[in-house]
Each structure stands twice: as structure tokens, then as C-alpha cells.
Interface confidence: low
């Protein structure tokens, strides 16, 4: 019995569902009563899911697996794995027994996009040419381990005096911190690029340092120039700092965070006390750091609706304020590709290829190209629909006349995360049946 699985690993984003494709060719007169199907972990032989005696025996793998019962009789033995975790990565074997027996293994490669790096500078005030500064680039919650590259404003790689550390959290996702020590010139731009080697996703940020003195007043409030980018569901820190004078005490401090446009109060600290969150109880200050001039605000479980500008007001004897922008983002899932019609295709046939990617933010940019990388722009219709959380599902449809054979690729780009998710389908112009989309 010939059992077919994809040669390439199946790549799945953490938290999404993955389909491990497996198919066999049923003979005429085949009935499900004859089928024994077992999915197991290739290395440990741990049972994952089975079908026997004409019945789905259910998941033996944390109740996160399912077959496609309506498709089994057509030879589709694919397995659906829900809410993928880093720990799921590895090889799964599909055993099919009717009268004969066959098996094949499919690899699951788990991935998670890295967040847009945040850049910090130490020291961050009164910089003069010739000073040594430490620039830290931090990117969060990615998998697998990242590759980190530094370069200057002219694109020249900076390799000396770089220290990079990567630490996995309890979910197995990595936080990466890369530190560059550099002696300032008259001015300079320093860029950090965090690459996910599996997703081929590049997340980058840069900082431009112009070490001309900005004369400091009693309260100079400093916030990042660039928007703070936060993934939906994660926590974001809106950085705000001031320079406390000698003898400063928290009793003198009035700190107010508010929405810049509506002036809605978000959080405050007055009369020496944290007055708490006025914003759905999802905000917090850093009380231990306030005396050092750190007035940053932590916003928990970020939602699309949080996007916008927040103003940090600091009053001691004098007064200062500055606004920081929050840009919310969510990565798009790896696109799924469907073909209509999907059987008995001939050169000259017109087919409709649909590329679907889910739950991203903000709206995506969609690009189609052929196997040679030539853009396909004609006969493309793309629609994007926001769900109740404000996340977008994108569906892009390409109508194309088949040549002898061809590859059609769809790339869904998140413009904020600079994350590219792509799917492709190769159609050979001989009579063929496109494998059913599980």
C-alpha cells in the first residue's frame, strides 16, 4: 500500500492549527470497515490518533487532534493538530492498513514570528561624539532561535562588540536580546535585524543618534520617537522618562497618562501614591523605578482598540509632556491555498486559486507571483474582513490560464511587523487530481 505525505516539513505558527497531510489510494469497493489508521510520534512511538473497526478511536494526544472523517473513504488520512505548541515539533508517522500495510512520516516544523525589536540606549542623555554607548535590541516570543544582524546607516555590517543572548520561556518561545557597544561619531544610525530562519521573517528597528546637546530643563520628558509595536494579546511598555533633580522625592511628582486625542485618563500617580488604572484595569506603572525618573506605563493584553497615541504628563516644580504612539499588530497565519477546479486539469484551463490567511493586523498587502518570481497582477481580487476583535482575515483570488505547468505563489505581508507569510501551489498540466485540501 502506497502512503503519501509531503516531502517538506509542514510549517505551523504557534497557536494555529496544522494539517499533517497523509493519503492513500483506496481500491474499488473499499469500505471504512477495512481501514486501520494509526498516527504516532515517529521517535517515541507514542499513539496520537487512530481509526479502527470502522470508527474514529479519537485523540490520544491531549485532545488536540482530529481526522477528516468525511474524506477518509476517498483516501485522505490527514491529521488536524489544533493550537500548535513548540513541544509538538517533530516527526509524525501515518500507518495505513487495509489488506496491505504502508506508512510514511511527515515532519512538523513549529514557528512563531519575532516582534518588532525595541531599541534602548545607555546612556540615553547628554551624548557627545566619542562617548561609548550600549545599544540593546530586544525582540520577543519567536521560534526557532533567531539570527541577529547589526548594521550602520550605510548598510555596513557591525560585527565587533556584539553580544546576543536568547532565552526560552515556559512555552519554548525565545526572547532575544542583542547588545552593541559602539563609540559615537558625529551622528549615526544603528540598525538591528532579527531574522526567523524558518519563516524567513525579518523584523527590524533602527536608532539614529545625533549627539548634539539638547539643553535639559527641569523636566524634559522623553519618549520613543518611533511607535511602540505590540502584538495582540501581549503586554506593551509605553516608555516615558524624566530627569529627577538631586533631592527629588515622589511626594513632589504628579504623573498622568492619558489618551492624546480624547484626553481620557489612563493612569495616574499623585500625592506620592499610585492612583491606579482608569483604563479597564489593564495598566500599571513601575513603582520601584519612578524615583529614578522612569514613568513608563505597562499596558496588558493589548487589543486592536488600544492603538493610538498616549501622552505622558510629568509635573514636579516644572511641567513637561510627550506623546508616544502604540501600533498594534498581529501576525498573519501561513496562507492556505485552494484550487477550483481541482481535478483533471489541462493546459489552457482557467483555474481559480484562492489564498487565505487569518487573524492578522493591520490590513495585509497581498502579492502573487509565478515560479520565476514574476508578479501576477491581472485578475486578482483581494478582500479583507475584520472580526469582532478587529483582526483581519484576508482572501485573495487569482484567476489564471494554465500553461504546461506552473507554480503560483501568494505572499501575505504584514506591513507593520514586516512579516511575510507565503504559500504556493504547483500545477502540472498533465491530467491530475489536486490533493484535497484538508
Amino acid at each position: 500500500l502506497e502512503v503519501q505525505v509531503p516531502e517538506d516539513p509542514v510549517v505551523a505558527l504557534v497557536g494555529t492549527d496544522a494539517t499533517l497531510c497523509c493519503s492513500f489510494s483506496p481500491e474499488p469497493g473499499f469500505s471504512l470497515a477495512q481501514l486501520n489508521l494509526i498516527w504516532q510520534l515517529t521517535d517515541t512511538k507514542q499513539l496520537v490518533h487512530s481509526f479502527a473497526e470502522g470508527q474514529d478511536q479519537g485523540s490520544a494526544y491531549a485532545n488536540r487532534t482530529a481526522l477528516f472523517p468525511d474524506l477518509l473513504a476517498q483516501g485522505n488520512a490527514s491529521l488536524r493538530l489544533q493550537r500548535v505548541r513548540v513541544a509538538d515539533e517533530g516527526s509524525f508517522t501515518c500507518f495505513v492498513s487495509i489488506r496491505d500495510f504502508g506508512s510514511a512520516a511527515v515532519s512538523l516544523q513549529v514557528a512563531a514570528p519575532y516582534s518588532k525589536p525595541s531599541m534602548t540606549l545607555e546612556p540615553n542623555k547628554d551624548l557627545r561624539p566619542g562617548d561609548t554607548v550600549t545599544i540593546t535590541c530586544s525582540s520577543y516570543q519567536g521560534y526557532p532561535e533567531a539570527e541577529v544582524f547589526w548594521q550602520d546607516g550605510q548598510g555596513v555590517p557591525l560585527t565587533g562588540n556584539v553580544t546576543t543572548s536568547q532565552m526560552a520561556n515556559e512555552q519554548g518561545l525565545f526572547d532575544v536580546h542583542s547588545i552593541l557597544r559602539v563609540v559615537l561619531g558625529a551622528n549615526g544610525t544603528y540598525s538591528c535585524l532579527v531574522r526567523n530562519p524558518v519563516l524567513q521573517q525579518d523584523a527590524h528597528s533602527s536608532v539614529t543618534i545625533t549627539p548634539q546637546r539638547s539643553p535639559t530643563g527641569a523636566v524634559e520628558v522623553q519618549v520613543p520617537e518611533d511607535p511602540v509595536v505590540a502584538l495582540v494579546g501581549t503586554d506593551a511598555t509605553l516608555r516615558c522618562s524624566f530627569s529627577p533633580e538631586p533631592g527629588f522625592s515622589l511626594a513632589q511628582l504628579n504623573l498622568i497618562w492619558q489618551l492624546t486625542d480624547t484626553k481620557q485618563l489612563v493612569h495616574s500617580f499623585t500625592e506620592g501614591r499610585d492612583q491606579g488604572s482608569a483604563y479597564a484595569n489593564r495598566t500599571a506603572l513601575f513603582p520601584d523605578l519612578l524615583a529614578q525618573g522612569n514613568a513608563s506605563l505597562r499596558l496588558q493584553r493589548v487589543r486592536v482598540a488600544d492603538e493610538g497615541s498616549f501622552t505622558c504628563f510629568v509635573s514636579i516644580r516644572d511641567f513637561g509632556s510627550a506623546a508616544v504612539s502604540l501600533q498594534v499588530a498581529a501576525p498573519y497565519s501561513k496562507p492556505s491555498m485552494t484550487l477550483e477546479p481541482n481535478k483533471d486539469l489541462r493546459p489552457g484551463d482557467t483555474v481559480t486559486i484562492t489564498c487565505s490567511s487569518y487573524r492578522g493586523y493591520p490590513e495585509a498587502e497581498v502579492f502573487w507571483q509565478d515560479g520565476q518570481g514574476v508578479p501576477l497582477t491581472g485578475n486578482v481580487t483581494t478582500s479583507q474582513m475584520a472580526n469582532e476583535q478587529g483582526l483581519f482575515d484576508v482572501h485573495s483570488v487569482l484567476r489564471v490560464v494554465l500553461g504546461a505547468n506552473g507554480t503560483y505563489s501568494c505572499l501575505v505581508r504584514n506591513p507593520v511587523l514586516q512579516q511575510d507569510a507565503h504559500g504556493s501551489v504547483t500545477i502540472t498540466g498533465q491530467p491530475m487530481t489536486f490533493p484535497p485540501e484538508a
Epitope: D126, A186, N187, Q212, P215, T216, G217, P246
Partner: antibody, heavy 119, light 112 residues
């Protein structure tokens, strides 16, 4: 060598505007900030503010907010001071002075531009 | 604003004799970074001001070693060990620790 060359003297009527230029040479203009300083007749020096020549951001002392504007043309390494709605009390010598880049001082000064406001 | 007070207003000196000018600030000039941005400028008759001393005690390039600066916190002094005829003019102390930068009212040094 470093030089800051300012435009010539100006005689203006009250309510008019004047634009004083300060052309820098002998160093990279966009590496160091430029300050503006006023000296009224027989009086001391008053710091008016400064402009970041890399980014163009001006900072004004409180007494010079409103009618006074600092600007740049980096293509010709020149800074400008424009004063609008001139008053008699604006009569003074106006100096541009380079920020030294390290010690928060003004290490090189222009020769000064005398602005006289009289009806 | 920080007020800078200089004394004396006028200082007649015989060539070869020492001279001393005092400058007092209304607040400490120690910046939060620990540095003190107190400077001295000289404006010779008919000329633009020129930098003499930066950060309390450092001579600017080309300034003769007969000029020296000292002090801390709010009290500062400029000394000329042996006055020469070319030293005449108005001496200004200036602070750049706090915005706005401010100058003292000036001390006019004259030759007796």
C-alpha cells in the same frame, strides 16, 4: 579654520521683519548645534536658544518664543534668525555661536549683525 | 531662570598685577550627570565674545595659562595671574546646566 560669517547691518521700521543669516565654514555644519545670542546696546549677553543642525529642531528661551524663528539651509551650511513684528526694543547686535559639541559651550562666534529698529 | 551675579562690576588693574572676578549662581550648577557647566567668556572692545574657560577650570585652546578658573556648586572665580594690556574687555560667566542658558551681567576689566 572654523568661521561663522553673518549678514550685514539692518535698519528696519517697527512692525517690519528681518532675516539674519549665519554661514558656517571649516567644519561639518550638521555635526554641531548653533546658538543665537542677543546683546542690546550697552547691555550684557542674552541666550535666545539654539537649533539642532542635524534634525532642524529649534529650542527657544521663554523670552524669544513667538516672533523669533530659527531655521536652516543645510545645503549652503547656513542658519537663519527671522524676527517679525519688529519693536524698538529688538534693537541689538545678534550673534550666532557654534555649540562646541562636548562641553555645552559656544566655542566660535559670528561677528554679529546689528539690527536697528526705528521709525 | 538661573540668575548669575558677577562682582565687581568694574575692575581697574595695573599691568603685571593679578585680578580676580567672582560669579555666583542662584542654584547649584551641578548637572544630573555630575558635571558642572560653568564657563567664562571675554568680549574685547568692538569684538564678538570669545570662550576662555569651560566647565569651571578648563582653558580653551589658545588661551594663555595666566587665566585660571575654580569653584563648585554656586560659587566660582576667574583669576588672571598677571594682567596684560590685551586682557581688557568685559568678562562674562555663563551657565549651561539649566535651560535657558544664562550669563552674568559682566565685569569690565580696565588698565589703570
Amino acid at each position: 579654520q572654523v568661521q561663522l560669517v553673518q549678514s550685514g547691518s539692518e535698519l528696519k521700521k517697527p512692525g517690519a521683519s528681518v532675516k539674519v543669516s549665519c554661514k558656517a565654514s571649516g567644519y561639518t555644519f550638521t555635526n554641531l548645534g548653533l546658538n543665537w545670542v542677543r546683546q542690546a546696546p550697552g547691555q550684557g549677553l542674552e541666550w535666545m536658544g539654539w537649533i539642532n543642525t542635524a534634525g532642524g529642531q529649534p529650542t527657544y528661551a521663554e523670552d524669544f518664543k513667538g516672533r523669533f524663528v530659527f531655521s536652516l539651509d543645510t545645503s549652503v551650511s547656513t542658519a537663519y534668525l527671522q524676527i517679525s513684528s519688529l519693536k524698538a526694543e529688538d534693537t541689538a547686535v545678534y550673534y550666532c555661536a557654534r555649540d562646541d559639541g562636548y562641553y555645552y559651550t559656544m566655542d566660535y562666534w559670528g561677528q554679529g549683525t546689528t539690527v536697528t529698529v526705528s521709525s | 531662570d538661573i540668575v548669575m551675579t558677577q562682582s565687581p562690576l568694574s575692575l581697574p588693574v595695573t599691568p603685571g598685577e593679578p585680578a580676580s572676578i567672582s560669579c555666583r549662581s542662584s542654584q547649584s550648577l551641578v548637572h544630573s550627570n555630575g558635571k558642572t557647566y560653568l564657563h567664562w567668556y571675554l568680549q574685547k572692545p568692538g569684538q564678538s565674545p570669545q570662550l576662555l574657560i569651560y566647565k569651571v577650570s578648563n582653558r580653551f585652546s589658545g588661551v594663555p595659562d595666566r587665566f585660571s578658573g575654580s569653584g563648585s556648586g554656586t560659587d566660582f572665580t576667574l583669576k588672571i595671574s598677571r594682567v596684560e594690556a590685551e586682557d581688557v574687555g568685559v568678562y562674562y560667566c555663563s551657565q549651561s546646566t539649566h535651560v535657558p542658558w544664562t550669563f552674568g551681567g559682566g565685569t569690565k576689566l580696565e588698565i589703570k
